[in-house]
Amino acid sequence: FKNDATEILYSHVVKPVPAHPSSNSTLNQARNGGRHFSNTGLDRNTRVQVGCRELRSTKYISDGQCTSISPLKELVCAGECLPLPVLPNWIGGGYGTKYWSRRSSQEWRCVNDKTRTQRIQLQCQDGSTRTYKITVVTACKCKRYTRQHNESSHNFESMSPAKPVQHHRERKRASKSSKHSMS
């Protein structure tokens, strides 16, 4: 699949089952470092999400016998968040002292911000199709966590690619194709 996006691209295959995506994912070569932020025009209280990048990802979905004919497109949130108070006479050293002194108690992470549900259709070897619903990431954000929060729960917000979950529809159809909803 050819994609000339200006952001980093990932391409891999995901099986639409409740388990985590396949670990033998292949990583495309990075083409660019993602989004860039400028301090120009920001007021002194603006926080810049330095390093929180929205990386474009493409992945084919397969459930064994059936595969999507086009890859699913979503964002992967990556990078480390270093929120900066932007001051008129900002000096890096001063920022470093403040940031690192607080680091033991709170931490910023680049996490999923917006998602949307998307329908995908897999083409099967016997000519039939299967339909799934998948949640894809469409925006990222920096989010602050306290150290205590981090230690008590490692499920900040899923940073892995979309994990489709399959369950049966309540109404049945007299059709050789099958449809699955995913949450």
């Epitope: 086009s70 979503e74 998307q118 259709q121 000519g127 199709t129 339909t131 894809v136 469409t138 449809k179």
Partner: antibody, heavy 119, light 110 residues
Framework: QVQLQESGPGLVKPSETLSLTCTVS????????VHWVRQPPGKGLEWIGV???????DYNSALKSRVTISRDTSKNQFSLKLSSVTAADTAVYYC?????????????WGQGTMVTVSS | QVMLTQPHSVSESPGKTVTISCKLN????????IHWYQQREGRSPTTVIY?????PDGVPDRFSGSIDSSSNSASLTISGLKTEDEADYFC?????????FGGGTKLTVL
């Protein structure tokens, strides 16, 4: 060779039901999605509804209460019924083949049939 | 509600290059597939670009498609304009699984 051909009356009276049939060849209705799209004179394209490859349907929310799309796979046909029509439903109606999602562009269009709603 | 917005009309001289934009009002356009259709007067639409930047067989390489994340828009570029390119152009995508169209752009070749 993929083909889609619309058929049905070109004139429908207000408050009646518009009925169109699309006969397809060169592909199976169980392997592709098929849509109805209309275009009022001098205006843009308006999606009416879809018959998914698995037999499920979805409709434009603005038309949902008046639209029914169904298929007869043995005849390679699918149909559109639009009830309680008004002059605003006057348009060229196209049946269209759509690829599978994600992506799913409309790769083949019928030639279109003009339907006028008038008494 | 997800919407695709196109300029109502554009015009350019033969041999020149013209670009038609299609702006998405929400989300990140990089997570959508954008398709482009050409509709000549009195004819059915035909695909000129699908999947953001791919050309169907038979469509000349004068037609190209691209996505610009910074403006959250897609573009159809036609180079070496010919009089036969005069037509309406529509962009198309899906909101979840519901098809959405741009309002269309009338291209006039002067």
């Amino acid at each position: 060779q993929v083909q889609l051909q619309e058929s049905g009356p070109g004139l429908v009276k207000p408050s009646e039901t518009l009925s169109l049939t699309c006969t397809v060849s060169g592909f199976s209705l169980t392997s592709y999605n098929v849509h109805w799209v209309r275009q009022p004179p001098g205006k843009g394209l308006e999606w009416i509804g879809v018959l998914w490859s698995d037999g499920d349907t979805d409709y434009n929310s603005a038309l949902k209460s008046r639209v029914t799309i169904s298929r007869d796979t043995s005849k390679n046909q699918f149909s559109l019924k639009l009830s309680s029509v008004t002059a605003a439903d006057t348009a060229v109606y196209y049946c269209v083949r759509g690829g599978l999602l994600p992506g799913g562009y409309f790769d083949y269009w019928g030639q279109g049939t003009m339907v006028t709603v008038s008494s | 509600q997800v919407m695709l917005t196109q300029p109502h009309s554009v015009s350019e001289s033969p041999g020149k290059t013209v670009t038609i934009s299609c702006k998405l009002n929400s989300d990140n356009i990089g997570t959508y597939y954008i398709h482009w259709y050409q509709q000549r007067e009195g004819r059915s639409p035909t695909t000129v670009i699908y999947g953001d930047d791919k050309r169907p067989d038979g469509v000349p390489d004068r037609f190209s498609g691209s996505i610009d994340s910074s403006s959250n828009s897609a573009s159809l570029t036609i180079s070496g304009l010919k009089t036969e390119d005069e037509a309406d152009y529509f962009c198309h995508s899906y909101d979840d699984h519901i098809p959405i169209f741009g309002g269309g752009t009338k291209l006039t070749v002067l």
